[in-house]
Amino acid sequence: SGTTNTVAAYNLTWKSTNFKTILEWEPKPVNQVYTVQISTKSGDWKSKCFYTTDTECDLTDEIVKDVKQTYLARVFSYPAGNVESTGSAGEPLYENSPEFTPYLETNLGQPTIQSFEQVGTKVNVTVEDERTLVRRNNTFLSLRDVFGKDLIYTLYYWKSSSSGKKTAKTNTNEFLIDVDKGENYCFSVQAVIPSRTVNRKSTDSPVECMGQEKGEFRE
């Protein structure tokens, strides 16, 4: 229940990739505005996105303070031009979000193959260690810094001349694989967090092939 000219937000949804985290909701406002609050289970509420007509709020700055905490957000609805007005129970109408634990739930962004280098019959494939917005000691941490050995990469590789794929895994950002001399290979990688039950895998990286600019060849 609430005032006759405000409706409660609904379909509150967390959209999070590599810890960049946005809360989205419906409906598009008609004669109303929204304010968002976020809190950890044991913490105080902090207000964000004051009196906005948007239906999303970037909460990254809050969740990166401790990505292993569980967060709850709520979206308050106010009549436009009369934000002091409250619902029938004497407080603004609001709706709670689902709980969100960034470390366990943020989607893994599409990885990128940074480089590959062939030395004889070995190829070293390096995955770009993407920077996140998580900070420690005033430094932005990489995905590997945050997840450590919890994060692995799966490499798919195949001869340019055939369709048969092979795979390898690493819990660093580098693969060292055996190849046939004189053959060109293509590569794609996928990030995985084996211990998770949801949002476990990223999409595959763009395919990179030998004979193109990212690679180096040495005898």
Epitope: T154, Y156, K169, I177, V192, S195, R200
Partner: antibody, heavy 117, light 107 residues
Framework: EVQLVESGGGLVQPGGSLRLSCAAS????????MHWVRQAPGKGLEWVGW????????IYDPKFQDRFTISADTSKNTAYLQMNSLRAEDTAVYYC??????????WGQGTLVTVSS | DIQMTQSPSSLSASVGDRVTITCKAS??????LSWYQQKPGKAPKLLIY???GWAEGVPSRFSGSGSGTDFTLTISSLQPEDFATYYC?????????FGQGTKVEIK
């Protein structure tokens, strides 16, 4: 509860084909890798191949690459193993297994394939 | 391809004995090794992963050690329900390969 149930095994003549199914419940196969492993009577375990059901990527032991095809239908939450040009030495119990990328944590009960004339 | 050499192929032991099974990889597989127990007519069951981590519900008498190329599964005090066949699996690169298996029998 996580469960994998294989079906489709049976008696087939040499040169014949068979399609095995692995029906998953209690999780979405697209979130995991799915493998097929076989075991000939009285012998050890032999890895056949895997699929990432989300993108269709498949990897095989090269010895099976030409005759076996792994596929998946995420709407049915089921993985498949299509086996062609079957030989007597393909007689085995075929298992499907779920892979977290760190280990195979759940296995089906297996389905017996017998290749004989 | 990576070969996994498992030994012994079989062993006889008594309840309460300490049992050690080894797996040797033909080249470095880092931590991508897991151990499985299989009883007759049943599917394999995960015991140990990342060479040292316990699977859910696995008794602490089972332990894993090693890295690189040499790995060991130890059963500190064999129990009646432990008589089974044990397999190692390398899943660091394809084709994934199992050891030949070790059958643990009652002495």
């Amino acid at each position: 509860e996580v469960q994998l149930v294989e079906s489709g095994g049976g008696l087939v003549q040499p040169g014949g084909s068979l399609r095995l199914s692995c029906a998953a419940s209690g999780f979405n196969i697209k979130d995991y890798y799915m493998h097929w492993v076989r075991q000939a009577p009285g012998k050890g375990l032999e890895w056949v191949g895997w699929i990432d059901p989300e993108n269709g990527n498949t990897i095989y032991d090269p010895k099976f690459q030409d005759r076996f095809t792994i596929s998946a239908d995420t709407s049915k939450n089921t993985a498949y193993l299509q086996m062609n040009s079957l030989r007597a030495e393909d007689t085995a119990v075929y298992y499907c297994a779920r892979d977290t990328a760190a280990y195979f944590d759940y296995w089906g009960q297996g389905t017996l394939v017998t290749v004989s004339s | 391809d990576i070969q996994m050499t498992q030994s012994p192929s079989s062993l006889s032991a008594s309840v309460g004995d300490r049992v050690t099974i080894t797996c040797k990889a033909s080249r470095d597989i880092k931590s991508y090794l897991s151990w499985y127990q299989q009883k007759p007519g049943k599917a394999p069951k995960l015991l140990i992963y990342y060479e040292t981590g316990w699977a859910e519900g696995v008794p602490s008498r089972f332990s894993g050690s090693g890295s690189g190329t040499d790995f060991t599964l130890t059963i500190s005090s064999l129990q009646p329900e432990d008589f089974a066949t044990y397999y190692c699996l390398q899943h660091g690169e394809s084709p994934f390969t199992f050891g030949q298996g070790t059958k643990v029998e009652i002495k």
